[in-house]
Interface confidence: medium
């Protein structure tokens, strides 16, 4: 006699927060402490993420959802789900293998993260430098010589940040 398998897997009845315990005739058992299952029908619970070191707990682990981490002050998240923390630098600096280093002359960084970027070359747009750049700020381009006729006074705002997803502060 061959027992026909039920069309419906008994484990599919186990809700999130439980697992289908093969050692107990596939009874739905609660996830043990420090573990979770975010979907039904799981045969095991996943170990909760621990936020330690530079990672801080943003959301505690529950039986149905993993813990979420962010970074301690002075660091910022990188990667999906804040899988890494990267050190902040000051404005006017960038992070290198040797720690935070000042932007080289002719470059700037107006954020605590990211790289130093070249000042805008005003002359490429036929404009002149109205305000010089610094390590922290891009140059401000002013009107071209031709625009300096009486009645003309337009100033181009600083170029937007060129790193996708990062807006200037």
């Amino acid at each position: 006699f061959e027992r026909t398998r039920s069309l419906q897997d008994p484990c599919s009845n186990c809700p999130a927060g439980t697992f289908c315990d093969n050692n107990r005739n596939q009874i739905c058992s609660p996830c043990p402490p420090n573990s979770f299952s975010s979907a039904g029908g799981q045969r095991t619970c996943d170990i909760c993420r621990q936020c330690k070191g530079v990672f801080r707990t943003r959301k505690e682990c529950s039986s149905t959802s993993n813990a979420e981490c962010d970074c301690t002050p002075g660091f910022h998240c990188l990667g999906a789900g804040c899988s890494m923390c990267e050190q902040d630098c000051k404005q006017g600096q960038e992070l290198t293998k040797k720690g935070c280093k000042d932007c080289c002359f002719g470059t700037f960084n107006d954020q605590k993260r990211g790289i130093c970027r070249p000042w805008t070359n005003c002359s490429l747009d036929g404009k002149s430098v109205l305000v010089n750049g610094t390590k922290e700020r891009d140059v401000v381009c002013g009107p071209s010589p031709a625009d300096l006729s009486p009645g003309a006074s337009s100033v181009t705002p600083p170029a937007p940040a060129r790193e996708p997803g990062h807006s200037p502060q």
């Epitope: 530079v54 990667g79 890494m84 923390c85 050190q87």
Partner: nanobody
Framework: EVQLVESGGGLVQPGGSLRLSCAAS????????MTWFRQAPGGGLEWVAN????????YYVDSVEGRFTVSRDNAKNSLYLQMNSLRAEDTAVYYC????????????????WGQGTTVTVSS
């Protein structure tokens, strides 16, 4: 399980020495930059030193240059921080972390941290 465990901290007098160790497990240690950080009482985390995969590149924060030496033994899956001429301002919890300030092409992030070991420099 990916894990880092620091040891070797303790109480030492100014001018003394300590050697911190960081034992790695659960990953291929020799593939990663490794970094030491510290956190003084009431302060933020400060990068101390880092070392590349084979130990040929080492970098230090200015305040410990010439006094601290970072090293590693890939055969033992271990990272070390030899601290000489210790000062009161070196008092902190010291953490090792996987990754480093420049271990990847696109980021400088650390993803695995130890629990820390406490170093107290006091007379």
């Amino acid at each position: 399980e990916v894990q880092l465990v620091e040891s070797g901290g303790g109480l030492v007098q100014p001018g003394g020495s300590l050697r911190l160790s960081c034992a790695a497990s659960g990953f291929t240690f020799s593939n990663y930059w490794m970094t030491w950080f510290r956190q003084a009482p009431g302060g933020g985390l400060e990068w101390v030193a880092n070392i590349n995969q084979d130990g040929s590149e080492k970098y230090y924060v200015d305040s410990v240059e010439g006094r601290f030496t970072v090293s590693r033994d890939n055969a033992k899956n271990s990272l070390y921080l030899q601290m000489n001429s210790l000062r009161a301002e070196d008092t902190a919890v010291y953490y090792c972390a996987r990754g480093g300030l420049g271990y990847g092409d696109s980021h400088y992030g650390m993803d695995v941290w130890g629990q820390g070991t406490t170093v107290t420099v006091s007379s």
